[in-house]
């Protein structure tokens, strides 16, 4: 594979002329300090740009906002500030875009010093706005019911929960002293409330409430709550155990009607739980270590969210600021990347290809030298910079990037050695979901994926003004440069429509002349670089997770393998906005790898067999499930959630109802009489950090 100066790279003929004819400059007559962008709808071409200039004076902030609207993917903008009556919009709330293609937009105004507030709402993709007075001051961005965009939920700065069923025209107060509120499935609202205190002092004494009728009635589904989170089909709550300051995780898969205790370690006051990722099959849970270690343990759940298997030790997750590098590689099923804090306090990257079953180091890129962190100059790994490096102000402009429709592609900053290096990183690319890597660009860059992987665009990260963009049509093997302006600009960001289906990229920045600066954007349309639509001959069959072509189980992950039709690297053509990933699954035979260890069992390191936990040997395996004492007959295995294997190895498993009552419902956790308290289930974990970056839940 070649990089920028690859010998085998020949440039696309006439690329500069084609791009020059498709480069659109827009100068904003605007001196504002910040700009936020939002795409309204999918494939509409509508972008809203909100610029904000604000100055804090004593206890209030005064400022000015301008609103601009584009209907052509950012090629031109119209100043539509008059639509919002020249009102100062709170930039911390951003632009709230409605779900799906509803065309709804909410802007929250800053009405300093008043008891109420004002919102501007649009139902026509920002063409027109009407303003509505709010009888409260929002504490955070108003949220839409994901299934009905007319229904809005808001938490006020006095911790009142408010609801509107008519897109903000009328509001009713649902509840007082609400600490956290979230939309569940089918219009359900979950929230924690403190009936006799405040949110700040009394965490751990909260009630978890549920309403399924927009606040006409409420049901208390749990008590003594510290925090709660939703992930996939699971509702999690961290609950005070009655043993002083300890908390435990409880889980429900029926919206809180019944609960079970998760087989995870309890945590103390200084620790936390965090859902790193969740879907309808399973959850990744981080459990913080005691003390200020900056790491914890990742556990993966069974399909009920009850039994957990230890997945990864010493997982980096700082309590200060709550930074973790945990990343779902969305371009390949089952792949996740994260960082561990090793014994010598260096940070190393780990990757799993089987949904947390096994973690390994990233393979060293070919043609890369091991850096100074490597003890052995011939043996080292690639280490990826993600959120933690960014929080440490390393020269890392972007987190790792992958897109579901750009199959197999992962782009990230990294260094090659025994651990993450503080030296200036380079950009690496994988075209097979993280199995193999190649250095793509020298030094730090901003990057984005266009046309479902048909084009990758990059801009060098520099403190100096820039005027050159780089692009590749062969998944980062060969690069061409294009000078998009004669007058370099101070670059602030690359913007492309979410979903990586667009062929337009906007370069945002500002120009500086004596005493003034103004915002400028350059939008480049690559449609003429990819002149024709891709045809059948442009695609080739690619087997995901292939590690050994001679093995007839090659590519089998979670019980099935997938063959994809992927664009040939040599094909320069448009996938197009309507491109749908073509994949063909085939079922694999079951092996022990397709099973996790059941309740009361664990896997010794480097062994695929599950063995009985010593402390449970000779004991009946009885545990509390849905309020009944259950007796488990098992040889130690339970199928991994989402695993589709058939035939092959088939361990026997049977659960018998012992017809005995027991309580795992933590509405009264002190009555818990199940024999399975603690971490008998292969030890497991959860997280009460529910809102950190893309993390599903952090306490």
């Amino acid at each position: 594979r070649s990089t920028e100066q690859g010998e085998s790279c020949s440039g696309l003929l006439g690329a500069d002329a084609k791009l020059a004819g498709n480069t659109h400059q827009h100068i904003f007559n605007d001196l504002s300090g910040s700009v936020s962008l939002a795409w309204v709808g999918d494939g509409t071409g509508v972008i809203l740009a909100l610029t904000t200039f604000q100055v804090p004076i004593f206890m209030i902030t005064i400022g000015q906002s301008k609103l601009y609207r584009s209907e052509d993917y950012g090629k031109s903008f119209e100043d539509v500030t008059n639509l919002i009556n020249n009102t100062f919009i709170r930039s911390d709330f951003g632009i709230a875009i409605g779900p799906e293609n509803s065309g709804k937009v909410i802007l929250t105004a800053d009405v300093s010093g008043s008891h109420g507030s004002r919102i501007f709402v649009s139902s026509d993709f920002g063409k027109s706005f009407t303003h509505q007075e709010l009888p409260f001051v929002p504490l955070m961005q108003i949220t839409y019911n994901p299934e009905n965009s007319n229904v809005l939920l808001a938490l006020s700065n006095k911790n009142e929960l408010w609801l509107s069923e008519d897109f903000g025209t009328n509001w009713k107060k649902l509840y007082d002293t609400v600490c956290l509120a979230k939309w569940g499935r089918k219009g359900t609202i979950f929230f924690t409330a403190n009936h006799n205190g405040s949110c700040s002092n009394d965490r751990g004494m909260l009630e978890l409430e549920r309403t399924t009728d927009y606040g006409k009635s409420f049901k208390t589904v749990a008590s003594k709550i510290y925090s709660f989170g939703l992930g996939g089909k699971f509702l999690f709550a961290s609950v005070m155990t009655g043993k002083g300051t300890l908390r435990a995780i409880h889980v429900s898969v029926d919206d809180g009607d019944t609960w079970n205790m998760a087989q995870l370690p309890s945590v103390g006051q200084e620790q936390f739980y965090s859902i790193l990722a969740a879907n309808d099959d399973m959850v990744f849970m981080h459990v913080d270590e005691p003390g200020d270690t900056g790491f914890g343990t990742i556990f993966t759940s069974d399909d009920r969210g009850i039994v957990y298997s230890k997945s990864l030790d010493r997982h980096l997750y700082t309590t200060t600021g709550g930074e973790t590098d945990f990343t779902n590689v969305t371009s390949l099923r089952g792949v996740y990347i994260t960082s561990v804090l090793s014994e010598d306090n260096s940070i190393q990257t780990m990757i799993t290809f089987d949904q947390g079953g096994r973690w390994t180091h990233l393979r060293k890129p070919e043609n890369s030298e091991c850096d100074a962190t490597a003890k052995n100059k011939n043996e080292c790994s690639l280490h990826i910079h993600a959120s933690y490096s960014i929080s440490q102000k390393l020269n890392v402009p972007m987190a790792p990037l992958s897109e579901p429709n750009a199959v197999g592609i992962v782009i990230a900053h990294g260094s090659v050695g025994d651990a993450i290096s503080v030296m200036v990183p380079d950009v690496y690319i994988s075209d097979d979901g993280g199995y193999s890597w190649t250095k793509m660009l020298e030094g730090p860059h901003y990057y984005t994926i266009l046309d479902s992987g048909g084009i990758i665009v990059a801009i060098e990260h520099s403190s100096r003004p820039i005027n050159v963009i780089k692009f590749s049509t062969d998944e980062g093997q060969c690069w061409q440069t294009y000078t998009f302006t004669r007058d370099p600009i101070y670059f602030t960001g690359l913007a492309s429509e979410p979903g990586a289906r667009s062929m337009n990229i906007s370069i945002w920045g500002f120009t500086e002349s004596f005493l003034t600066s103004q915002w400028v954007s350059y939008t480049i349309d690559f449609k003429d670089i990819l002149e024709r639509n891709c045809e059948e001959k442009d695609y080739t069959i690619w087997l995901a997770h292939s590690t050994d072509p001679e093995d007839y189980e090659d590519g089998c992950i979670l019980g099935y393998k997938e063959q994809f039709l992927r664009l040939r690297k040599s094909s320069v053509c448009q996938n197009g906005r309507d491109y749908v990933v073509t994949k063909q699954p085939s079922i694999c035979l079951c092996s022990l790898e397709d099973f996790l260890c059941d309740f009361g069992y664990y896997r010794p390191e480097n062994d695929s067999k599950c063995v009985e936990q010593p402390e449970l040997k000779g004991h009946d395996l009885e545990f509390c499930l849905y309020g009944r004492e259950e007796h488990l007959t098992t040889n130690g295995y339970r199928k991994i959630p989402g695993d589709k294997c058939q035939g092959g190895v088939n361990p026997v498993r049977e659960v018998k109802d012992l017809k005995k009552k027991c309580t795992s419902n933590f509405l009264s956790p002190e009555k818990q009489n199940s024999k399975s308290n603690g971490s008998a289930g292969g030890s497991g974990g959860l997280n009460d950090i529910f809102e950190a970056q893309k993390i599903e839940w952090h306490e």
């Epitope: 069959i541 087997l543 093995d551 007839y552 090659d554 393998k561 063959q563 063909q584 085939s586």
Partner: antibody, heavy 120, light 107 residues
Framework: EVQLVESGGGLVKPGGSLRLSCAAS????????MNWVRQAPGKGLEWVSS????????YYADSVKGRFTISRDNAKNSLYLQMNSLRAEDTAVYYC?????????????WGQGTMVTVSS | EIVLTQSPDFQSVTPKEKVTITCRAS??????LHWYQQKPDQSPKLLIK???QSFSGVPSRFSGSGSGTDFTLTINSLEAEDAAAYYC?????????FGGGTKVEIK
Amino acid sequence: EVQLVESGGGLVKPGGSLRLSCAASGFTFSSYSMNWVRQAPGKGLEWVSSISSSSSYIYYADSVKGRFTISRDNAKNSLYLQMNSLRAEDTAVYYCARRGSGSYDAFDIWGQGTMVTVSS
Amino acid sequence: EIVLTQSPDFQSVTPKEKVTITCRASQSIGYSLHWYQQKPDQSPKLLIKYASQSFSGVPSRFSGSGSGTDFTLTINSLEAEDAAAYYCHQSSSLPLTFGGGTKVEIK
């Protein structure tokens, strides 16, 4: 020219043994998985056995498991099939076939076949 | 085991006519389906691999399509030399299996 040539077939009594050989030429034998496929008179094709390039993966059809043994000698560019406890239903033309280098690839090169007759 | 059902078993066709042979798998095999031609008293020869990829040296009148469970081999304009048995073969799952074959005869 890429070529596979089978030998070792013949007439054998039920319960008897036979060893088939396949000589490869014209390609890097040690880089490919190899297979035996058979065809009973007037019938279709039936896969018998498979061996990976370094012999780490060996697979058999249920009908021959425990009776047939596949092996290879990369130094001699040769593939073998040791057939024991032969039955009348093993009567067929036995083809040696190379598997392409891709995952789940096809049999891209076939030998001319050698006839095995099991009869008393 | 994955069963491959080929149809028709037999086809008598005049030259220049289009021939279509189908192969149905008992469960999804992705694109891991290959087609072979076997002329009388000869060994099989690979025509199409991975459902639609023509093998080198195979005349362009032979084409394949399909994925998952349903596959088709098409001979666009039959020639006399195409009289043979045609077999589909799946390599997705052990045991490897072949279809029962389709015998194409020239009228």
